[in-house]
Interface confidence: low
C-alpha cells in the first residue's frame, strides 16, 4: 500500500493524497490519516483533496485500508507534507503614527512573498476601525490620505490576500492619534467696496488665525452690545460675516474670536467708521431786503441734512458755477453774491463728500431793476432774512 | 438643579398686554441669555426674542418687533417678558429658555414650565 | 428668512424599531442645527445641539447627524418613552434669527 502526495506546498496550493494498492484487492473500506488522526473515510480506493492547504495542513500522513479478511489489513508509507508560508502577516506602517491635524498620511502594508513564489499577485485594503478607507482592494500596498482630521484618531490595520482569495492575511492594530494645533493669533479685518465702509453698501468681517487645525468655530461680537452676532464653524484659517447694507447704526467697535476646542483666542478690537453719503441738500436764499434788488448782496445757503464730512458744495447759476465752499465739520455752507441784473433765474447747489453728489431743487429768483422794474414776469418774493420764495 | 418657574396662566381681552414672568435658580443668571418662545395650539416653536441677561441688550424677532419687550431683574434673578395689542391669535403657551451652554450655537438646554395666555373678548 | 421643513409629518413605528427623521433647510445653515423632543403638555427637552453632539444626559440611541441643508435624528431602537414630536431648529448669521421646523410625531403602531 503506497501514499502518493507532494512533500512540499504552499498556502493557497490543492494537495491531493493518493493512497495505491493492487487492483485485484477487495476492501471493505479505506482511510486517510494525518498525525494518527483519522481524517476521512472511504468504501473503496480514493483520492483525498485538501483545497487550499493552510500552514495547519503540515504533518505526518499515511493510507490504511480494511480487508474482507484480517490478513488484507494494510498501511501504506507515511509521508510528511510541510506546507510553507506564500507571505508573511502583513506589518501596518505609517509616515506618522502622530500626525498633526490637517496634514497628509502615508499607510503602507508591508508583506514578503516566498522567494520560490514571486510570481503570485497580492491585493490590500486598509481599515480604519471597522470601515474600508480609500477605494477598498487594490494592487497597491500604500494608501496616501491627504489630510487627516482630529476625528480620524483610532485603530488602524491592514489586510492582504492572493488575488485568486485563497489566501487573506491581517495585520495587528495599530494606533493613530492626530494631534490638533492650537489657534493662534486672531485677526479681524474689514473689507469694503472702495476701502471705506460706506451706508446702504456691503461689509465683510473677515475673521482669521495664523494658526490651528481642524473644525474652527468663528464667532463675531459687537464691543458695545457684547452679544454674538453670527457665527461660522468651518475647516479653515478665516471666515467671513457679510453685512449686505451697512447701516449708520452699525458704527462701532467689533471683535472677532476663534476655538477649535482648546482655549478660544480673541482679535484686537476693530473701530468701524460708516460713512454716510450725501443727503439731497436744501438751497435757502437770503437777501437785505424784502425784493430782492440789483446791488444787493444776496446770501446762498446750501446744507446736506445727512453725510459724512467733509461736503464740498458747489453753487451754480443756470447750471453756471459761481463758487464752492466747503463744511469740514459737516453742516452748510454759504455762498455770497452782489446781485446785477443778471442775475435772475434758477439757482441751486451740489453736496458732495467723495460717496456720490446729490443736487438741490432749483430756486428761481427775479431782481428788481434800479428804476423799481422787474426783470423778469415772475416775483421771488424776497424778505429780509428770509428764503427767498420761489418766483 | 437648574429651574426655570414662569408665572401663572393669565386671560387678556384683545388689545391688551400681558407681562410673564420667569425665575431662575440653580445657576449663575447673569452668565446665560434667556430666550422667549411661544407656541400656538397644535402649531411649532416660535422664537420671540431674548436678552443678553449680563448687560440687559435684547434681540427680537422681527414679527414681534415693536409689540414685545424683554426685560430682567438680576437682583430677584427674573426675566420677563410683555406682549402688547394682544389679538386672539397670540392665545398661546408661552416659554422662557435659557440659551445652552453647549454648543456655539442659540439651542436651549432648560426651559421654563410655560405660561398659557388666553386672548378672548 | 431660512424655513425648516420636517418629515414625514408622523412616523408610525414599534418599540424596537429604527426611526429616521429628516429637517431640510431652505438655504446652508452650516451644522448650527438642534433637535428637541415634546411631550404633550411639557417643555421642549433639548437632545441634538450643533447637528451631533448629545446633550447632557441623552441616552445614546439618539444621534444626529447631517451639515449644509439636510439633517438626520435617528433613534436607533425605539423605547416607549421615546413616542413624541420631534423639532429641529436653526439660527441663521445675518439677521440673526431662529426658527423651528413644523415637527416630526413619532407615534405607536
Known amino acids: 500500500l503506497t501514499l502518493v502526495a507532494p512533500s512540499s506546498v504552499f498556502e493557497g496550493d490543492s494537495i491531493v493524497l493518493k493512497c495505491q494498492g493492487e487492483q485485484n484487492w477487495k476492501i471493505q473500506k479505506m482511510a486517510y490519516h494525518k498525525d494518527n488522526k483519522e481524517l476521512s473515510v472511504f468504501k473503496k480506493f480514493s483520492d483525498f483533496l485538501i483545497q487550499s492547504a493552510v500552514l495547519s495542513d503540515s504533518g505526518n500522513y499515511f493510507c490504511s485500508t480494511k480487508g474482507q479478511l484480517f490478513l488484507w489489513d494494510k498501511t501504506s508509507n507515511i509521508v510528511k507534507i510541510k506546507v510553507q508560508e506564500l507571505f508573511q502577516r502583513p506589518v501596518l506602517t505609517a509616515s506618522s503614527f502622530q500626525p498633526i491635524e490637517g496634514g497628509p498620511v502615508s499607510l503602507k502594508c508591508e508583506t514578503r512573498l516566498s522567494p520560490q513564489r514571486l510570481d503570485v499577485q497580492l491585493q490590500f485594503c486598509f481599515f480604519r476601525e471597522n470601515q474600508v478607507l480609500g477605494s477598498g482592494w487594490s494592487s497597491s500596498p500604500e494608501l496616501q490620505i491627504s489630510a487627516v482630521w482630529s476625528e480620524d484618531t483610532g485603530s488602524y490595520w491592514c489586510k492582504a490576500e492572493t488575488v485568486t482569495h485563497r489566501i487573506r492575511k491581517q495585520s495587528l492594530q495599530s494606533q493613530i492619534h492626530v494631534q490638533r494645533i492650537p489657534i493662534s493669533n486672531v485677526s479681524l479685518e474689514i473689507r469694503a467696496p472702495g476701502g471705506q465702509v460706506t451706508e446702504g453698501q456691503k461689509l465683510i468681517l473677515l475673521c482669521s488665525v495664523a494658526g490651528g487645525t481642524g473644525n474652527v468655530t468663528f464667532s463675531w461680537y459687537r464691543e458695545a452690545t457684547g452679544t454674538s452676532m453670527g457665527k461660522k464653524t468651518q475647516r479653515s484659517l478665516s471666515a467671513e460675516l457679510e453685512i449686505p447694507a451697512v447701516k449708520e447704526s452699525d458704527a462701532g467697535k467689533y471683535y472677532c474670536r476663534a476655538d477649535n476646542g482648546h482655549v478660544p483666542i480673541q482679535s484686537k478690537v476693530v473701530n468701524i467708521p460708516v460713512r454716510i453719503p450725501v443727503s439731497r441738500p436744501v438751497l435757502t436764499l437770503r437777501s437785505p431786503g424784502a425784493q430782492a434788488a440789483v446791488g444787493d448782496l444776496l446770501e446762498l445757503h446750501c446744507e446736506a441734512l445727512r453725510g459724512s464730512p467733509p461736503i464740498l458744495y458747489q453753487f451754480y447759476h443756470e447750471d453756471v458755477t459761481l463758487g464752492n465752499s466747503s463744511a469740514p465739520s459737516g453742516g452748510g455752507a454759504s455762498f455770497n453774491l452782489s446781485l446785477t441784473a443778471e442775475h435772475s433765474g434758477n439757482y441751486s447747489c451740489e453736496a458732495n463728500n467723495g460717496l456720490g453728489a446729490q443736487c438741490s431743487e432749483a430756486v428761481p429768483v427775479s431782481i428788481s431793476g434800479p428804476d423799481g422794474y422787474r426783470r423778469d414776469l415772475m416775483t421771488a418774493g424776497v424778505t429780509e432774512t428770509s428764503q427767498v420764495a420761489p418766483a | 438643579q437648574v429651574q426655570l418657574v414662569q408665572s401663572g396662566a393669565e386671560v387678556k381681552k384683545p388689545g391688551a398686554s400681558v407681562k410673564v414672568s420667569c425665575k431662575a435658580s440653580?445657576?449663575?443668571?447673569?452668565?446665560?441669555?434667556m430666550h422667549w418662545v411661544r407656541q400656538a395650539p397644535g402649531q411649532r416653536l416660535e422664537w420671540m426674542g431674548w436678552?443678553?441677561?449680563?448687560?440687559?441688550?435684547?434681540r427680537y424677532s422681527q414679527k414681534f418687533q415693536g409689540r414685545v419687550t424683554i426685560t430682567r431683574d438680576t437682583s430677584a434673578s427674573t426675566a420677563y417678558m410683555e406682549l402688547s395689542s394682544l389679538r386672539s391669535e397670540d392665545t398661546a403657551v408661552y416659554y422662557c429658555a435659557r440659551e445652552g451652554s453647549n454648543g456655539w450655537h442659540e439651542d436651549f438646554d432648560y426651559w421654563g414650565q410655560g405660561t398659557l395666555v388666553t386672548v378672548s373678548s | 428668512e431660512i424655513v425648516l421643513t420636517q418629515s414625514p409629518a408622523t412616523l408610525s413605528l414599534s418599540p424596537g424599531e429604527r426611526a429616521t427623521l429628516s429637517c431640510r433647510a431652505s438655504?446652508?445653515?452650516?451644522?448650527?442645527l438642534a433637535w428637541y423632543q415634546q411631550k404633550p403638555g411639557q417643555a421642549p427637552r433639548l437632545l441634538i445641539y450643533d447637528a451631533s453632539n448629545r446633550a447632557t444626559g441623552i441616552p445614546a440611541r439618539f444621534s444626529g447627524s447631517g451639515s449644509g441643508t439636510d439633517f438626520t435624528l435617528t433613534i436607533s431602537s425605539l423605547e416607549p418613552e421615546d413616542f413624541a414630536v420631534y423639532y429641529c431648529?436653526?439660527?441663521?448669521?445675518?439677521?440673526?434669527?431662529?426658527?423651528f421646523g413644523g415637527g416630526t410625531k413619532v407615534e405607536i403602531k
Open positions: 438655504q446652508s445653515v452650516s451644522s448650527y
Open positions: 440653580g445657576y449663575t443668571f447673569t452668565s446665560y441669555a
Open positions: 436678552i443678553n441677561v449680563g448687560n440687559g441688550n435684547t
Open positions: 431648529q436653526q439660527r441663521s448669521d445675518w439677521p440673526p434669527s431662529l426658527t
